[in-house]
């Protein structure tokens, strides 16, 4: 089994709709601080042929902009691949559709290899309840405690959202 | 520092199976990522498998994916490598590995072992 748990049961499907970035990590800080290429927010998913797609938001000159991603599936039923910021393998590692995801990518960028996970949930006023979840996460995957940035509602573009 | 010695290699007929072992001595197994690499003769060595710290998490090359199967005993210190439908191409030394981070980069991993030779005959 690769991950905690694989695709959700229902499928892919019961991914999409909206959803809000709550934290991030990685053993690159600077690609999670102000500006870097990793600081996006996602602002909904949804799901076709196997294949996730999202719109994320990517703060740019004191604006967000909403970017359309796709990550395309593979033969491992919770890897996909995705270009963005150079190749990543990106990991479902704990689903609950109806209430939080976690996900970590294996980006390579040029001749470098990092780590980035990404904790989102469907209700803000719940993110407290899965911060634990993905610290867990983060810890078994190598990533500590102070490498995690919690987002505030300035951070994740909250005024640019529908 | 961490001592990591491999066994379990061996000569099999393609489509056989083997299981290798990594058995770790030092300092706590648990606080690391294990993986495992190979390096076929002339070539570069490459990524095969890594698992997270409690096993919870595993992933695999393409080439191996289905095939081959990463677990790791926390209890007995140990990491291993269920290789199944075994390929000729699969034929290699076969490292074991430990580092910080669950990563496919080589250079990720501070401690390696000697190597185990897995050869996969027609």
């Known amino acids: 089994q690769e991950g905690n748990h694989e695709e959700p049961q229902g499928g892919l499907e019961e991914l999409s709709g909206r959803w809000h970035s709550v934290a991030l990590a990685s053993n690159k800080s600077d690609l999670i601080k102000p500006w870097g290429h990793f600081r996006v927010f996602i602002h909904s998913m949804s799901a076709k042929d196997g294949n996730l797609h999202g719109d994320i938001l990517i703060p740019q000159d004191g604006q967000c902009e909403k970017v359309s991603l796709t990550a395309f599936k593979t033969a491992t039923s919770n890897k996909f691949d995705l270009e963005y910021w150079g190749h990543n393998d990106l990991y479902l590692a704990e689903v609950d559709p109806k209430s939080y995801l976690i996900l970590y990518m294996i980006n390579q960028y040029n001749d470098d290899t990092s780590l980035v996970a990404h904790l989102m949930v469907r209700d803000l006023s719940r993110q407290q309840d899965f911060l634990p979840a993905f610290e867990s996460v983060c810890e078994d995957i190598g990533l500590h405690k102070d490498q995690i940035v919690v987002l505030s509602d300035d951070d994740r573009c909250q005024g640019s959202r529908d | 520092e961490v001592q990591l010695v491999e066994s379990g290699g061996g000569l099999v007929q393609a489509g056989g199976s083997l299981r290798l072992s990594c058995a770790a001595s030092g300092r706590t197994f648990s606080e690391y990522i294990m993986g495992w690499f190979r390096q076929a003769p002339g070539k570069e060595r490459v990524f095969v498998s890594t698992i997270s710290k409690s096993g919870a998490i595993t992933n695999y090359a393409d080439s191996v994916q289905g095939r081959f199967t990463i677990s790791r005993d926390n209890a007995k210190n140990t990491v291993y490598l269920q290789m199944n439908s075994l390929k000729p191409e699969d034929s290699a030394v076969y490292y074991c590995?430990?580092?910080?981070?669950?990563?496919?980069?080589?250079?990720?991993?501070?401690?390696w072992g000697q190597g185990t030779q897995v050869t996969v005959s027609s």
């Open positions: 590995a430990a580092g910080p981070l669950l990563s496919p980069a080589g250079r990720q991993y501070d401690y």
